[in-house]
Each structure stands twice: as C-alpha cells, then as structure tokens.
C-alpha cells in the first residue's frame, strides 16, 4: 500500500474543532483521489467522512459532513468540526488514488485526536 | 490493450534456477507495482512477490515460501519484470502469473520442478 | 502475518439466486481487500477492488462491501457464466498480500 503520513497527535480547538494534513506518496499520476477518515476504537472501525476529488480541484466533501478540507499536490488539508470530549481517539487517513488504473490504497497510522469539552461558565450575578 | 506476456518457464530439476520475464505493454509501466502470483495444479492463488516503482525506491516483498530463494528485479526502460527463482523445489510448480497492480494479468506460464 | 480466511469452500446454487461468500482477516485491513473471478482453465481477474469498487467491465449483479475485518462478495442474480474460483485478497501493507482459499461456486 502507499505510504500515507499524517501528525500523531492533534488538540481540538475550545469549539471542538481539529485540523491536521494528510499526505501521500503516489506511485503513480493520479487524476481521481479519494480521502477518507476513519475513526478506530478498539476493534471497531467506522467511517467519519470521505470525499472524492479530481487532481488540481477542490476537495468536496457531502453538505452533511463534519469534515472539510482543501488539497495541494499529494496533501490533503482536513478539518473536522463539532467534537466532543466522547469523540476523543485514533483518526486515521485512508487514500485510494481512483483512476487511472492501477489502483492503489494507503492507510496512515492515525491522529489521536483530544478533544476536551469547555467548562461552562458560572452564573455570575450583576 | 494492455498485455503482460510471461516467458521463460519448463521443466528444471530440483535446486536448480530458472528466471521468467514479464513484458509489458499498453500501459504505462513505470507507474505500477509488478507482483508474481502463482498456482499450483489444482490450487488456489499464492501471491509470491512485489517490486514497487521508481517514487518507491524500487522495493521488493516477498512471501515466507520464496523469500531467500526468489529475487524480483525490473527494467523500466524495456517494460518488462524478471522472476529470478534459485534452489527450486518441487512444491514451487505452478502456473507463474505476472500481473501489474492487480488490475492487469498475464496468461502464466509453466514451471514444473521434478527429478 | 494477516491471515485471510474465506467460506464457504464450495457452494451449490441455481441460476437467479442470490450468492454470498465471505472473507475475514485476521486483523484489521480497513477495506483493503480485492476480489478476483477465475474461470476454469482461465486468468484470474479483478472483480472488486478496495472492497467495494467494481472493475472496468465487471456485472453490477456483482457486488462487495464490508470494512474492518469482515468482507463480503455477493452476487445479486448468478448466472451460468458466474460458475468460477472466486478469492480475496489483502492488499494493505506490508505484504504479504494474501489470498484467501477461494470458493468455487457451481450451478445446481
């Protein structure tokens, strides 16, 4: 499979908001490229977002999605947004360079995302 | 069209070598990982080894049946990727298919080792 | 080394039945996964790739799905040309690329 670099350890933002970049090495010239972000717990794997984009374009991820992101050459920008505290764990990077043939897969080793929950501010009297 | 031909396969005697070739054209070779998979009559599939492409520094994998025995090595400017197969055995034959990626296949060819 | 292991070996159904066979790794491949078609006396070729994705030229009765370390070829309607070896394949780094066993899949 392709190498696929992306950060160890990323901290969400006070909004719960997490960023990091995902980069792969193409064996080959590439015009169709999908991302996918995988959040693993345990055993348990299970699909955060995914977009697919052609070369030199935007990266569009559904309307719905929690992720957005932006792409330059073989890197991938993402962000994901509304997290919380429960949401802390492994992200990883999955990408599939598409077309043309061949095809090939790449997995990252993961982004342990932190993501800890505002304490909400006291009543204060005026 | 994309065709991958093997060659260079027959009959050899165990712990001698035999070295098979795969040419390749329709496609644009340089871009790809070259795997040799092989069969063994009335088998199933055992994937016997990769070279990966020039961005990768050429690296090659090889199964723990081979891996010792067997060298892949490939010549971009030719198209074509070699199987060197030393101190053969007798469970070694099988059917030899090239293929590039995983998406392309050659026909095989025939390797038989017995006394 | 991640282990491939497919099911059933064999199988037996008729034309217009709808067909599953299975595949499990012995860790997690996060959809890493081909599946091939072999005719008797024929090429292997890819059927699906990365899971889920048809080849170029492959029916839509054929489909695949699954993540993690369960995998699944179905074919929605089996025809008499369907009647091959069909096997999976890790694909995720490092090698080796494993195949599972294959099922042969007849018509009854």
């Known amino acids: 499979a392709m190498h696929v670099a992306q950060p160890a350890v990323v901290l969400a933002s006070s909004r719960g908001i997490a960023s990091f970049v995902c980069e792969y090495a193409s064996p080959g010239k590439a015009t169709e490229v999908r991302v996918t972000v995988l959040r693993q717990a345990d055993s348990q794997v299970t699909e955060v977002c995914a977009a697919t984009y052609m070369m030199g374009n935007e990266l569009t991820f559904l309307d719905d999605s929690i992720c957005t992101g932006t792409s330059s050459g073989n890197q991938v920008n993402l962000t994901i947004q509304g997290l919380r505290a429960m949401d802390t764990g492994l992200y990883i990077c999955k990408v599939e360079l598409m077309y043309p043939p061949p095809y090939y897969l790449g997995i990252g080793n993961g982004t342990q995302i932190y993501v800890i929950d505002p304490e909400p501010c006291p009543d204060s009297d005026f | 069209e994309v065709q991958l031909v093997e060659s260079g396969g027959g009959l050899v005697q165990p712990g001698r070598s035999l070295r098979l070739s795969c040419t390749a054209s329709g496609f644009t070779f340089s871009d790809n990982w070259m795997n040799w998979v092989r069969q063994a009559p009335g088998k199933g599939l055992e994937w016997v080894g990769q070279?990966?492409?020039?961005?990768?520094?050429?690296?090659?994998y090889y199964s723990d049946s081979v891996k010792g025995r067997f060298t892949i090595s490939r010549d971009d400017s030719k198209s074509i990727v070699y199987l060197q197969m030393n101190s053969l055995k007798t469970e070694d034959t099988a059917v030899y298919y090239c293929?590039?990626?995983?998406?392309?296949w050659g026909q095989g060819t025939t390797v038989t080792v017995s006394s | 080394d991640i282990q491939m292991t497919q099911s059933p070996s064999s199988l037996s159904a008729s034309v217009g039945d709808r067909v599953t066979i299975t595949c499990g790794a012995s860790?997690?491949?996060?959809?890493?996964l081909n599946w091939y078609q072999q005719k008797p006396g024929k090429v292997p070729k890819l059927l699906i790739y990365g899971a889920t994705n048809l080849a170029d030229g492959v029916p839509s009765r054929f489909s695949g799905s699954g993540s993690g370390t369960d995998f699944t070829l179905t074919i929605s309607s089996l025809q008499p040309e369907d009647v091959a070896t069909y096997y999976c394949q890790k694909i995720l780094s490092p090698p080796p690329w494993t195949f599972g066993g294959g099922t042969k899949v007849e018509i009854k």
């Open positions: 860790e997690i491949i996060y959809g890493a």
């Open positions: 070279i990966r492409n020039k961005p990768y520094n050429y690296e090659t």
């Open positions: 293929t590039g990626g995983m998406d392309y």
